[in-house]
């Protein structure tokens, strides 16, 4: 017979999603079993029929990835998750609503922190994300958010930081005392969609003046 | 060397339509985010709509939403602005521009559009 | 929509000058802040972006400085070819949405 409460097989259905890497995980309830077997459907919001998940049916692991079926930006999508303990009870979980563009949460860039006597110089590489554009290309978080910026950080000393942000991708921090060590800190940021990321962070020394030796 | 060059502007009645064109040349054309932007007779400047080339992701200012439409060709390098239902007040010069390492520097030399009756 | 509200609409300088144009944003947008000039019957051009740093090609007369909602353009000797429009644009979010600029005229 079917429990009192699928909470006792299934709970915590939901989508964590990172640069747009979509994964479907759930845990166990307290009457869960390590035989326990999971199967993954999901459907488009506004489609009746959900779509059984290849590769994700009678699994025992608790994640799925449902990136390339949830890749198109402009939708909306549910998953459910179906429990099958070893003694045939089942339960069944439907995530909330999906929008990998609303979910999505940004893992700090990646940067390049170049040491120079007085400046140090940060380079951020464009972040790919698994979502292909028509041409096959991968589109990175720049195609996707228009009002995407690096904010970065230079912390100076304990009381004094200098900052800098911009849409482009190279920076350079002026005016530093040669032969010294900084905290730099990059994040992402997507105002529009109130999204920040962690930060990259960078410990670099600049390059000691020679020109007096 | 970047150039961009805009055409279709004319005089056009109101409720009529009006395809623009740009063609750019001297940058990826096919991995960047395109512009326009309008000038009011005397008046000052107004970003209308944006696309990326590569996501086909579009925004456009709420006093054209439904009315215009931004699109690209990416094998022709060529970006157009579709303008439908045209009213007296989108009478202007319409520029289209093209950000390049983070930064809307470079703009065509703007196609004067006039609705009138 | 952030609102960019440009001072003053128009200014009368003398050659050799120092010309300060102010820009207040609705809301505060970092440093995305740039700012143009524009000619008659000419596109704009840019000529400060990030709030402070000078695109190339721009002489330095031109300065730029200001965070979060308060900016300010400086023109420290006004020359004959600075007579023209200036606009405050911000980069922060759609719309990207200018000042109502400021005429620089000869006095």
């Known amino acids: 017979h079917a429990p009192e409460d699928p909470s006792d097989l299934l709970q915590h259905v939901k989508f964590q999603s990172s640069n747009f890497e979509n994964i479907l995980t759930w845990d166990s309830g307290p009457e869960g079993t390590p035989d326990t077997v999971y199967s993954i459907e999901y459907k488009t919001y506004g489609e009746r029929d959900w779509v059984a998940k290849k590769g994700c049916q009678r699994i025992t692991r608790k994640s799925c990835n449902l990136t390339v079926e949830t890749g198109n930006l402009t939708e909306l999508y549910y998953a459910r998750v179906t429990a099958v303990s070893a003694g045939g009870r089942s339960a069944t979980k439907m995530t909330d609503r999906f929008s990998s563009l609303q979910h999505t949460t940004l893992k700090p860039p990646d940067v390049t922190c170049i040491s120079k006597v007085r400046s140090i110089q940060m380079i951020v590489h464009p972040t790919p994300t698994p979502i292909r554009a028509g041409d096959g290309h991968r589109l990175t978080l720049e195609d996707i958010f228009h009002d995407l910026f690096y904010h970065l950080e230079l912390q100076v000393n304990r009381t004094y930081q200098m900052h800098l942000g911009g849409k482009q991708r190279e920076y350079e921090f002026f005016g530093l005392t040669p032969d010294t060590e900084f905290l730099g800190t990059i994040m992402i940021c997507v105002p529009t969609w109130a999204k920040e990321s962690a930060p990259y962070m960078c410990r670099v020394k600049t390059l000691p003046d020679r020109t007096w030796t | 060397e970047v150039q961009l060059v805009e055409s279709g502007g004319g005089l056009v009645q109101p409720g009529g339509s009006l395809r623009l064109s740009c063609a750019a040349s001297g940058f990826t054309f096919s991995s960047s985010w395109m512009y326009w932007v309008r000038q009011a007779p005397g008046k000052g400047l107004e970003f209308v709509s944006v696309i990326n080339t590569r996501s086909g992701i579009t925004h456009y200012v709420e006093s054209v939403k439904g009315r215009f439409t931004i699109s690209t060709d990416n094998a022709k390098n060529t970006l157009f602005l579709q303008m439908n239902s045209l009213k007296s007040e989108d009478t202007a010069v319409y520029y289209c521009?093209?950000?390049?390492?983070?930064?809307?520097?470079?703009w065509g030399q703007g196609t004067q559009v006039t609705v009138s009756s | 929509d952030i609102q960019m509200t440009q001072s003053p609409s128009s200014l009368s300088a003398s050659l050799g000058d120092r010309v300060t144009i102010t820009c207040q944003a609705s809301q505060s947008i970092s440093s995305l802040l740039a700012w143009y000039q524009q000619k008659p019957g000419q596109a704009p051009k840019l000529l400060i972006y990030?709030?402070?740093r000078l695109q190339t090609g721009v002489p330095s007369r031109f300065s730029g400085s200001g965070s979060g909602t308060s900016f300010t353009l400086t023109i420290s000797g006004v020359e004959a070819e600075d007579l023209a429009t200036y606009y405050c644009?911000?980069?922060?979010?759609?719309?990207?949405?200018f000042g109502q600029g400021t005429k620089v005229e000869l006095k």
């Open positions: 521009a093209t950000r390049i390492q983070g930064l809307i520097d470079y």
């Open positions: 644009l911000q980069d922060y979010s759609w719309p990207l949405t």
């Open positions: 990030g709030a402070s």
